[in-house]
Interface confidence: low
């Protein structure tokens, strides 16, 4: 999947299986990524687990779990708030669009999480205070938490280079260095560009991610995934000057 | 004790369902659990110096990683939901959010916090 980290780095990761996105004293988020096509290096998120840890007099430990075709509007215990404590309503799940869009607000830690199902796969977005992000036992050990440090270098796909190589080449398909098997021939480059331009008129990294995803999979739902990801940034990002990210030298992951 | 090694140990215990020597087809899951365990021990390292269980864990992880040919990089295991311990009152640290009323939006010393964003989408 495409990852925008807490430090606004933008990466395309091919990590498969269960990986931690966030882990601190208050919140644990893990995703499971699966290949989008058989034999593909490109992966998308098929499962998401969010654990809100027990916090003082506010909330009991609550677990939210979403999977492909199952985006519940409740925690796994069936509740929609933080439990029986007097501050239980400081943690709330709201269903925005049934089966497609859920928002979780944890006021006690100033955190908002948006989970969506777009097509077959899930998207995740979070707004969280830096102080909560930094509330970890040992900063140095946070090497594999994707939101904090990004993907390991060997798990990244250089989709920007791919975009540059394919731009303006008509129906050029994914070549030998491709991260995935060739997508259906019905998606030439121009069509992918046109479809992405409809939803993402600004040619930023979200637009480029959209083009990459269409060429990789032939699945138009990925256009919506990129569109909603940008919409979630608009809602959640505190710096309105950083809504759009543009192509630049690829960052190395934090170490 | 601020040393959270018991938390790491019990999470690992749960993740491996008590299986000390998993069958070969379980090895990827076992390795993922070991990596989670290793991460957990590193997170609590500074507060565990001299702790018997902590050092036993560190050495045990190295042994098990080697026995099962686990690579140090790779996926970690999904948390076992029923065993993740609470961050409850007794474990609150000095850098914890100081919330007077749960219903009020997050604050610390009345300052507006610096927010940050992370997102994951597409392929």
């Amino acid at each position: 999947p495409h990852l925008r980290t807490f430090t606004d780095r933008f990466q395309t990761c091919k990590v498969q299986g269960a990986w931690p996105l966030i882990d601190n004293n208050y919140l644990n988020v893990q995703v499971t990524n699966t290949p989008v096509l058989p034999g593909s290096a490109a992966t998308a998120t098929s499962k998401l687990t969010i654990i809100f840890k027990n916090f003082q007099e506010c909330v009991d430990q609550k677990v939210y779990q979403a999977e492909m075709d199952e985006l519940p509007a409740a925690f796994v215990d069936g509740s929609k708030n933080g439990g029986d404590k007097h501050g239980a309503n400081s943690l709330k799940i709201t269903e925005k669009v049934s089966g497609q869009h859920v928002e979780i607000r944890a006021k006690y830690i100033g955190t908002t999480i948006v989970v969506r199902q777009v097509g077959r796969y899930l998207t995740f977005a979070v707004r969280v205070p830096e102080e909560v992000v930094n509330a970890v036992e040992d900063w140095d050990s946070q090497g594999l938490y994707l939101c904090l440090r990004g993907c390991p270098l060997n798990q990244q796909i250089d989709f920007q280079a791919f975009h540059t190589n394919t731009e303006g080449t008509g129906a050029r398909r994914l070549a030998a260095a491709s991260p995935a098997p060739t997508a259906p021939e019905t998606f030439p480059y121009e069509t992918a560009v046109a479809k992405c331009k409809e939803k993402l008129p600004v040619e930023d990294l979200y637009y480029q991610a959209c083009v990459f995803d269409l060429l990789t999979t032939g699945d138009v739902n990925f256009t919506l995934a990129a569109y909603y990801a940008l919409e979630d940034v608009k809602m959640l990002h505190s710096n309105k000057d950083k809504l759009h990210l543009y192509e630049r030298t690829r960052d190395l992951p934090g170490r | 004790s601020p040393c959270k090694i018991l938390k790491c140990n019990s999470e690992f215990w749960s993740a491996t369902s008590g299986s000390h020597a998993p069958a070969s087809d379980d090895t990827p899951e076992f390795c993922a659990a070991l990596r989670s365990y290793a991460l957990c021990t590193r997170r609590t390292a500074r507060t565990c110096r001299g702790d018997l269980a902590y050092h036993s864990a560190v050495h045990g992880i190295e042994d098990l990683m080697s026995q099962h040919n686990c690579s140090k990089d790779g996926p970690t295991s999904q948390p076992r939901l029923h065993t993740l311990p609470p961050a409850g009152d007794s474990q609150e640290r000095s850098d914890s959010p100081e919330i007077c009323h749960c219903e009020k939006s997050f604050h610390k010393h009345s300052a507006t916090p610096n927010y940050t964003h992370c997102g994951l989408f597409g392929d």
């Epitope: - | 036993s56 560190v58 045990g60």
Partner: antibody, heavy 120, light 109 residues
Framework: EVQLVQSGAEVKKPGASVKVSCKAS????????ISWVRQAPGQGLDWMGW????????NYAQKLQGRVTMTTDTSTSTAYMELSSLRSEDTAVYYC?????????????WGQGTLVTVSS | QSALTQPRSVSGSPGQSVTISCTGT?????????VSWYQQHPGKAPKLMLY???KRPSGVPDRFSGSKSGNTASLTISGLQAEDEADYYC?????????FGGGTKVTVL
């Protein structure tokens, strides 16, 4: 075969020090901690402390802090326990024991014991 | 006085079952998975019989079993045999200390 072999019996005067050795064989010495446990005549087991041969880190029972020193020599796979300012109540059999690793916390292999007698 | 309390002695006839209790606090026993049991014959070194409350090392007969309820851990010997006559000690890791019970003498009648 995993084994811990301890040094022989000692007789010491009050105020003196004693150093007991424990030689490990049959396993990777640095992969397990070594605990020391003592047992006064006719009494129960009393945990004294632990050392990591890997890092040299130690963890001593509170009541012995300042009097006990545990060390290891990884080149010979030997652990040592030194107890200073001996008193008559330190008369006991002293055992070294291997600590199981990771979450498997237990003392799974024991030395044969070393009798230390403190008498004037 | 030990922080873990065991009965001084228990006895049973061959073939019977005996249970030894080990009572501590919530931190030493109740919340701990680190309860182990050791058998000691006179003049010998202790031998590990159970660890992590219920687990048996290889070589320990399955007539030895462990359990825990609240702040009390228990060792049960079912089908008592003559060679089971010995002292038994419970042990718990608590915080940074390892605690032993006072020991229980098991007598086979």
């Amino acid at each position: 075969e995993v084994q811990l072999v301890q040094s022989g019996a000692e007789v010491k005067k009050p105020g003196a020090s004693v150093k007991v050795s424990c030689k490990a064989s049959g396993y990777t010495f640095t992969s397990h901690g070594i605990s020391w446990v003592r047992q006064a005549p006719g009494q129960g087991l009393d945990w004294m402390g632990w050392i990591s041969p890997y890092s040299g880190n130690t963890n001593y029972a509170q009541k012995l802090q300042g009097r006990v020193t545990m060390t290891t020599d990884t080149s010979t796979s030997t652990a040592y326990m030194e107890l200073s300012s001996l008193r008559s109540e330190d008369t006991a059999v002293y055992y070294c024991a291997r600590v199981g690793s990771g979450p498997y916390y237990y003392m799974d292999v024991w030395g044969q014991g070393t009798l230390v007698t403190v008498s004037s | 006085q030990s922080a873990l309390t065991q009965p001084r002695s228990v006895s049973g006839s061959p073939g019977q079952s005996v249970t030894i209790s080990c009572t501590g606090t919530s931190s030493s026993v109740g919340d701990s998975i680190y309860v182990s049991w050791y058998q000691q014959h006179p003049g010998k070194a202790p031998k590990l019989m159970l660890y992590d409350v219920t687990k048996r090392p290889s070589g320990v007969p399955d007539r030895f079993s462990g359990s825990k309820s609240g702040n009390t851990a228990s060792l049960t010997i079912s089908g008592l045999q003559a060679e089971d006559e010995a002292d038994y000690y419970c042990c718990s890791y608590a915080g940074t200390d390892t605690l032993f019970g006072g020991g229980t003498k098991v007598t086979v009648l």
